[in-house]
Structure formats: C-alpha cells, structure tokens
C-alpha cells in the first residue's frame, strides 16, 4: 500500500489585493487518520491558517465539501487578501494522537499579492 502523499500542485499563486486566494491541496489516501492543517511559513514560528479539527478561521473556507466521508481535497479559499498575507503556504497532514503529530507536508504554494486595480 502506497504511503499518503500531500499534493500542492501550484508552486505559486498571484492575487490582487481585496480578492480571494485559492490554495489547492489534495491527499492520496485517508490513512493514516488525522486532521489537515494549513500554515503560512515553516518552522516553529509558522502561522496556523486553518485547522480541520477545531478553531475559528473567519477568512478561510474549504473549497470542496469537507463533510463528505471520502473527501481528499483540502483546498482552501482565503478572502479579502492584503499584502500582509504574502508568503508560502503549506498544507500539512497530521497523524492522530495525544497530541497529533505532523506526518507529511506539501511542497508549499507561494502567495504573492498584486496591487488592487484602480
């Protein structure tokens, strides 16, 4: 059985300020069991953008229907993009546990923000 892969197909995405950014992520298996999280940046200072398991993320919505039992698409949309949102976003699969542990990360998608069209 092949090991789960986290696929972020877009190396970079460019969005105009004020628009929404769609960041794509799919996994190739539902196993191992555990949540998906999105982060901006890497390392200990990375910023949590979305946690499938818990939390309130008012600017973030899932693109596909995450309540489908067979769902493997964890793409997100971030609304009202500003220059402060620029950075590299990582889709990360966690393995369930106490606490959950990081299992595999996508390669990252770099978000750049264009000036708002006048």
């Amino acid at each position: 059985e092949e090991e789960l892969q986290v696929i972020q197909p877009d190396k970079s995405v460019s969005v105009a300020a004020g628009e929404s950014a769609i960041l794509h992520c799919t996994v190739t298996s539902l196993i191992p069991v555990g949540p998906i999280q999105w982060f901006r940046g890497a390392g200990p200072a990375r910023e949590l953008i979305y946690n499938q398991k818990e939390g309130h993320f008012p600017r973030v919505t899932t693109v596909s229907e995450s309540t489908k039992r067979e769902n493997m698409d964890f793409s997100i949309s971030i609304s009202n993009i500003t220059p402060a949102d620029a950075g590299t976003y990582y889709c990360v699969k966690f393995r369930k546990g106490s606490p959950d542990t990081e299992f595999k990360s996508g390669a990252g998608t770099e978000l750049s923000v264009r000036a708002k069209p006048s």
Epitope: I31, V33, P35, Q52, E54, E65, T67, R69, E70
Partner: antibody
Framework: DVQLVESGGAVVRPGETLRLSCTAS????????MSWVRQAPGKGLEWVSG????????YYADSVKGRSTISRDNSKNTLYLRMSSLTAEDTAVYYC???????????WGLGTLVTLSS | ALTQPASVSANPGETVKITCSGG?????YGWYQQKSPGSAPVTLI????KRPSDIPSRFSGSASGSTATLTITGVQAEDEAVYYC???????????FGAGTTLTVL
C-alpha cells in the same frame, strides 16, 4: 443552544413506508453532516445512515441499504429518513445526530419511536 | 464490531475505566452516555479525547492503537448509566457502536 427535534414516528404495518423528520436549530445546519442512529427495544445503538452537509453524498448501513433514503432540505433546516418495506427489525427509537469533523456525533435529538405491528 | 465490557461497578469517588477495542488504527472513537433506555444519548467524548464544553471534567478519553478508554475520575451516583463507545472507520465510511457498558455506582 443546539437543538434537534425528531418527528414522524408511528405504529406501522410490515411492508409499509414511513418518513421521519429532524428539525435543527441553534447552529448553521447547512455546514454540518448529519446522521440517523436507532435503538431497538432493549438493544444498543445502531448507526443507520449519514449525509454530507450539502446533501450530495449519502451513506447507509447494510441493514437498511436499498430500502431507505436519507435527504435534507437546508432551506428548512430539516433532515429526513424515508424507510420502505419495513419489518419488525426496524422497530426502534430513531435519533438524529450532528456529526463532528471526523463523523462522530456531538449532539443528539430526543428520538422518535417507530413501532411495527401486524 | 467494537468490544466493551458489559458492566462495571464502583464506589462513589473511585476512578472507573471503560475500554473499547476492535476499531483498528483507521478509526476515531467517541463515548456516549444514556441514562435510561430510549432517552437521548449525551456525547461525553468525541475525536478520542475531545470533551464538549458542557461535560464535567471528571470524564476524559484517550486512545492508543485500536483501543479507546473512557475514564471517570471521582465517580458520582448520577453517573449510573449505560456508556456506549462509538467509532468511525475511514476505510469503510461506516459508524459502529459497542454493545454498551452498564455502570453501577455502589
């Protein structure tokens, strides 16, 4: 407060059809997957059927597959279960339950009783 | 199917552990309390160890491998009930329940 109120339970004859309803309040119904769980007299809990938040995807236990249909009307905050070809084994209290992110249950209704009688 | 003991008993103030096995490592577990047959179940734990905000802190959950455990620390008379473990399996898309454990407080 989350509230789930089932209705539609009745005394019915074997072979008949019945539709149960569950009206939800206190949360954004259209954002949550839902399930039906039943409990026969003197027995334990048995999952019957589940449905994704939009209603596009449905799931059934083998015991009801092919003769039950789960559906929902998000504009009415209502979940349904239509059961046909009823038999004595379908006698139970039927609960609707809200699903968590990983398809367990966090809130339950009070239940509605379906009794088969010839 | 999930396997749990048919009954357990304890004196008030004691700690009770109820185990549930058989779900495999592709499952999450929850625990549901039913105080009388036909009454609405109450979720004590979901996602192995998540306790809803309105549930007393004496209830806790854990999971290791294919076994989940519900722990009641300082059991009270009002905890007399049937406790069901439930699981969701990501390989079958199906929910299952154990047969229930009757807790008697002596």
């Amino acid at each position: 407060d989350v509230q789930l109120v089932e209705s539609g339970g009745a005394v019915v004859r074997p072979g008949e059809t019945l539709r149960l309803s569950c009206t939800a309040s206190g949360f954004t119904f259209s954002s949550y997957a839902m399930s039906w769980v039943r409990q026969a007299p003197g027995k334990g809990l048995e999952w019957v059927s589940g449905i994704s938040a939009s209603g596009s995807d449905t799931y059934y236990a083998d015991s009801v597959k092919g003769r039950s249909t789960i559906s929902r009307d998000n504009s009415k905050n209502t979940l349904y279960l239509r059961m046909s070809s009823l038999t004595a084994e379908d006698t139970a209290v039927y609960y609707c339950a809200r699903e968590t992110w990983n398809h367990l249950f966090d809130y339950w209704g009070l239940g509605t009783l379906v009794t088969l009688s010839s | 199917a999930l396997t749990q003991p048919a009954s357990v008993s304890a004196n008030p103030g004691e700690t009770v552990k109820i185990t549930c096995s058989g779900g495999g490592t592709s499952s999450y577990y929850g625990w549901y309390q039913q105080k009388s047959p036909g009454s609405a179940p109450v979720t004590l734990i979901h996602s192995d160890d998540k306790r809803p905000s309105d549930i007393p802190s004496r209830f806790s959950g854990s999971a290791s491998g294919s076994t989940a455990t519900l722990t009641i620390t300082g059991v009270q008379a009002e905890d007399e009930a049937v406790y069901y473990c439930g699981g969701y399996d990501y390989t079958t898309y199906v929910n299952t329940f154990g047969a229930g454990t009757t807790l008697t407080v002596l």
